[in-house]
Structures are given as C-alpha cells and as structure tokens.
C-alpha cells in the first residue's frame, strides 16, 4: 500500500521528506517565506495530506501562491507611490506614502516606505502596520511676506496667500430683534481649528456674565482675499465656539478663544495654518516687528451678504496688512496709566504701535494674528491676538495697540484641541 | 474713573428733533454696550433700549420704535440717541447708563424740554 | 412685559433703624443661563441713579455693606440695615432677564 511520490509545490516544501510513504503516513505541505498554501482557492499556512489504505493520497498537493498586501490603504492628505513597476502589491514590494506637499508635513519624519510583508500587511520599520500621520503644515506661506526692515506707515494690500491663516469671522445672532451682527478676525490653527479673540464670540446681551455666542450664529471665512469676491473662499460653520474661562470684559485679560469647524477644510495655496509660539511668559521681545492683517470692517450697519458678496461700506474690500514693533512692556503700562480710566495691561498682553500713533495702529480686526518670523523654524508664528486699545482710538499718539500674548495659553489651547503636545510638535516653534 | 459725560440741555419746540451725546471714558469701550433710560419729571424710569457697540446695532423697547434712534461714533467713544419729530410729552431727563443689562454706571442726565 | 411692583411706595426711616423693600415681579426673573438679573439702584435727589445691588444680592464696589439683597423667582428684597442720612431717594428695582428691561416704581426714602 504504498503512495505515489510526491513532488513540493514550486515555493514550497513538504515534511517529512521520504524516499517511501505508506498507509497512514501524513505529508505537511507548507510554502517558503512570502508564499502561502493554496487549496480550493482558500490560502492557509500548511495543508496536511495522507497516504489512504488503497494507496491513494487523500487530496491532491496545493500550490504556493505568493503574498498580496493588497491595496494600502488611502492616507488622508496624502499619496502613495509604487517602487516596483506594474504597481505590484504582493510580497517584498515597496510603497512610499508622502503628504500632500507643501501643506502637510509627515509626523516625526518618517520616510513612509512600507513592505509588503510575509504575513500579508503593509509593514513600516518605526510604524510596524500604523499608516503615518500627515499634519498640516503651519507659518508658511505659498508666497513670501515681506522682510521686515522698513517700517509701513498705514495698511498696504495683501497679495493673496501672504496671510493664508486669515480667518473672517461673522457673528450674525438671529434670536435677537432686530438681529444682531459684527465681524471679527481669526488664524487658522489646524485643518479644524481657528484662534481668535473672546470679545469677537461674546454676546454682548448680558454684561454681568460672559456668554459665549450660539455656534450656529458663526461663520468663518478662510482664504478670503477681496470680500466682494468669496468665490475662490472656504466658508464653514462651527461645531464648537470655547471662550477662555477666565475672559474678563472689565479689562479684556485672558482675551482668547476658539472655534473648532464643522468640518476640516482642505488646505492649500491660500489655507494655510499658522504656528504657535513656545509656552514663554516673556512673550515677544521688544521692538521686534510683527505683522496684523485685517479688512478693517468697522461700519455697524453693513450686512453680511453686504460684506461677503459686495462688500460695500466697509473700510477696505482687499486685506491689509500692517507691519508694527513690539512695546516694551513698562513703556505700554505707563502710556495708558497715563490716561484717566481703569485700564490694565497685565502679563497677559503686550502692545504694539508707534509713539508718534497714526493709521498703523488702527489696522487689523479684532482676534486677528499678530505674526512674527521666527528665524529658526523659518516659520511665522503668531505671538498676539488683536484685542483692545488702538482699534478704539484710531491714531492716538501713544496708545498703542493692545495684543493677547498667545505664549501664555499655548497649553491651553493644546488642551482645548484635544491634541498631547508631542502629536503636534512640528506646529510649535522651535 | 469710568465717567458717562453727556451733552448739555436742549430747549426744543414742537416737530424739531435732537441729538444727546454720552462720551465714555476709563473702560473699554466696545466692551460694554450703552442702554437709555428716560425719566420724565416727577416720574419713574422707563428703559428706552440699548445699542450694541462691538456690533452697532441697536435694539429698541417698543415705546421707543419709530422716532428714536441710537447711533455710535466708536472713535469719539460716544453713543448717541436722536429723536425726531418732538411731541411735548417727550420732555423729561435722557441717561445713557453702561450696559445692555448691568446699567452699572450712569451720565449725568441730560434734560429735553419740548415746549413752543 | 414683566410688571415690577414695589411695596411700600414710600419709606420714613429713623436713622440707625432697619429698613426693607419689597420687589415683586409678575414673572420668574431666573433666566435660561442660570442667573436672576434683579438689580437695585438708588436715586439721589437731583442726581443720576447709582447702582448699588447686581444679580439679586452682589454688592458694587463702594456700596457699604449695611444694603444687602435677597430673594428668587418672583420675590425679592432690598435691606439696609441701620439707614443713613446719604441713604434718602428713590429706590428702584429693575429685571434685566426678560426683554425689555423694566423699572419697579420706586420706593421714596426719607428720614424722619
């Protein structure tokens, strides 16, 4: 009763290899690395097989079929490339996965490259079968902000994309009679997130109590260059509207706020993230010269529909921008000291402006980003959120403008997005 | 030092209109928005409305629709209330008071009298 | 609107005595956001109203603390423990819960 010989798959082995089989020996089909057994169409590691009593084996030998990862799977803001040619997926084949330059950067540097491995999956030597991460890029603009050497007296037009992180943002609150409306700035922090300053998303209804405006009032612009142009803008609503819990109305301390989108918008040319600053209580050294853009919407009777399709009756249609100095912090409390009322610069804020004022301190709505270049991330980042002083007093001699230092709330903002700070350390100045 | 300062008396007659100014000073502005009160002589305090003045926009009590109009100039940091077309029985004391609802300060009053 | 009602109209008060006024509203002034916007002013003779009472029973800064506010939903009070020849004039309540805001009548206080 002895068995036919056998011969082992192409790609495999059988066990035990004999000269001989006879009734009741068992042969176990199994495959070289990257191949697996295939029988009946059903793939499985090893296939046993026996020498039956009328010398017969009990099923025929399998074959080995090689290893497919199959497709990989889609990275969001990102693209895969094949290494070998006909896009093959099977066993030992290289893919790179890399996002979607330049406004997404791959997390922690990681070369994407992926092997199809023995066991069927898609395999990074640091990630093993995690897909990477790709993070938007933040503080680089698709074209160039000026260099900051000379001062510009007065706002000069931005040339689209200079200020990719400008945010409009309308506040139209229709539970009111008659509905109450107004504008504010933002920065775009992440493909979700805006920064802006907790006056533009407080309701002003009660004055006792800080209420923050109903999400379903507000509406944030990005990409916005000519407010009588939205057709190449963004615009989304907010799932979320998160006022810093200490925002004081007395004297505008702790100034900062965020909104999270309904839904991630698509970066690009003209939608770009800006960077946070450090966590520094020190905040941005004196005399060093920012950037504020804004379209500098100050008419209380002009509709929305007024400002995002005609954009009539506003102070500028094209975004401007302004270029100003940091001021040293005892010169900023001194000047306003100076002037009878109640006013409050704390460690929370820092001014920016000109002793002489004029237009330049004027510019620039409220919440919006107050950049600086940081010279080592070659990254702009923003360091200040319009909040109160300049806008009020158009070109007051020295009352500067007054900005929330952004590096005191680094943490909470982390917090607030819901991200650990080492996920995102490409967004933080270094 | 937070101070409501506003315009002096008006003698106006019948059919005439004007305009009381509240300059504010020692807060910051936009941060609190500006009610009017009306107080007839002898009388009671009536609330006229108030205007936002991040946003601009006023909102008025219903016996204050029509011929009264709260305007604001954020440069001067100066509410305004106009009314047109005065009757006599719009003579009384106007206050502009900090607040939409706090009312936590209040201008000096400025009287209208309305006679011919 | 919501009708405040202030008993009594008017008030003689021997100085150092207690004195009270009672502020109904024709509605609940407890708003949606959790707070009751109730308010006291005081009205000097020939002067501009002064607040003295926020959110029924916060004090402003400057007010003595013999004037002390109470109450919840409809009913409230204003107390002043051991009046003062600077507490005459008018006393008014006032509800900022509900649009528009609107005046008790006022209560007239006088030293006898």
């Known amino acids: 009763n002895e068995c036919p010989e056998l011969q082992p798959p192409v790609h495999g082995k059988i066990e035990p290899s004999q000269a001989k089989y006879f009734f009741k020996d068992q042969v176990l089909v199994s495959c070289d690395t990257g191949y697996k057994v295939l029988k009946d169409n059903v793939e499985m590691d090893t296939f046993q097989i026996e020498c039956l009593k009328d010398g017969t084996w009990s099923n025929k030998i399998p074959t080995c079929k090689i290893v497919d990862c199959r497709a990989p799977g889609e990275l969001e803001h990102g693209l895969i490339t094949f290494s070998t040619r006909n896009n093959l997926t099977t066993y030992k084949s290289e893919i790179k996965y890399s996002c979607q330059e330049p406004y997404y950067k791959m997390l922690n540097n990681n070369t994407g490259i992926y092997t199809c491995s023995a066991q069927g999956v898609w395999m990074n030597k640091v990630l093993g079968r995690s897909l990477p991460t790709c993070l938007p890029e933040c503080g680089q603009p698709s074209r160039s902000l000026p260099s900051l050497v000379k001062r510009i007296i007065g706002g000069r037009n931005a040339e689209p994309g200079l200020f990719p992180w400008q945010a409009l943002i309308v506040v139209e609150d229709t539970s009111r009679v008659p509905n109450d409306k107004w504008f504010g700035s933002g920065a775009l922090l992440s493909a979700s997130w805006i920064l802006t300053a907790a006056h533009v998303l407080r309701s002003q209804r009660r004055d006792t109590t800080v209420i923050p405006v109903s999400k379903e009032h507000v509406t944030v612009y990005l990409g916005l260059h000519d407010v009588r142009d939205k057709s190449g803008a963004v615009n989304s609503s907010a799932a979320r509207v998160v006022l810093h819990p200490d925002f004081n109305i007395q004297n505008y301390n702790h100034d900062i706020a965020l909104v999270q989108l309904q839904e991630p918008v698509p970066l690009g040319p003209h939608v770009m993230p800006v960077c946070l600053p450090r966590l520094e209580p020190e905040g941005p050294a004196p005399h060093m010269l920012g950037l504020v853009a804004g379209w500098g919407i100050s008419n209380p009777n002009v509709t929305v529909d007024e400002i995002i399709s005609s954009g009539t009756r506003t102070l500028s249609d094209v975004l401007q921008y302004v270029k100003l100095p940091v001021v040293p912090h005892a010169e900023c409390k001194t000047s306003y000291e100076s002037r009878s009322g109640n006013y409050s610069v704390t460690e929370n804020m820092f001014c920016a402006g000109y002793y002489e004022g004029g237009k330049d301190t004027c510019l620039g709505d409220s919440g919006g980003a107050f950049v600086i270049f940081d010279d080592l991330s070659q990254r702009w980042v923003v360091q200040g959120l319009v909040s109160w002083g300049g806008p009020e007093e158009c070109g007051s001699k020295q009352v500067y403008g007054v900005y929330t230092k952004v590096s005191n709330y680094v943490d909470w903002v982390w917090e607030q997005m819901g991200l650990p700070q080492s996920v995102v350390e490409p967004q933080v100045e270094r | 030092q937070i101070q409501l300062v506003q315009s002096g008396s008006e003698l106006k007659k019948p059919g005439a209109s004007v305009k009381v100014s509240c300059k504010a000073s020692?807060?910051?502005?936009?941060?609190?928005?500006m009610s009017w009160v009306r107080q007839a002589p002898g009388k009671g305090l009536k609330w006229m409305g108030w205007i936002n003045t991040y946003s601009g926009v006023p909102t008025y009590a219903d016996d204050f629709k029509g011929r009264f109009v709260f305007s604001l100039d954020t440069s001067v940091r100066t509410p305004y209330l106009q009314i047109s077309s005065l009757k006599a029985e719009d003579t009384a004391t106007y206050f502009c008071a900090r607040g939409g609802e706090a009312m936590d300060y209040w201008g000096q009053g400025t009287l209208v009298t309305v006679s011919s | 609107d919501v009708l405040m009602t202030q008993t009594p109209l008017s008030l003689s008060v021997t100085p150092g005595q207690p004195a009270s006024i009672s502020c109904k509203s024709s509605q609940s002034l407890l708003d949606s956001d959790g707070k009751t916007y109730l308010n006291w002013l005081l009205q000097r003779p020939g002067q501009s109203p002064k607040r003295l009472i926020y959110?029924?029973?916060k004090l402003d800064s400057g007010v003595p603390d013999r004037f002390s506010g109470s109450g919840s939903g409809t009913d409230f009070t204003l107390k002043i423990s051991r009046v003062e020849a600077e507490d005459v004039g008018v006393y008014y309540c006032w509800q900022g819960t509900h649009f528009p805001w609107t005046f008790g009548q006022g209560t007239k206080v006088e030293i006898k």
């Open positions: 959110l029924v029973s």
């Open positions: 020692g807060y910051i502005f936009t941060s609190y928005g």
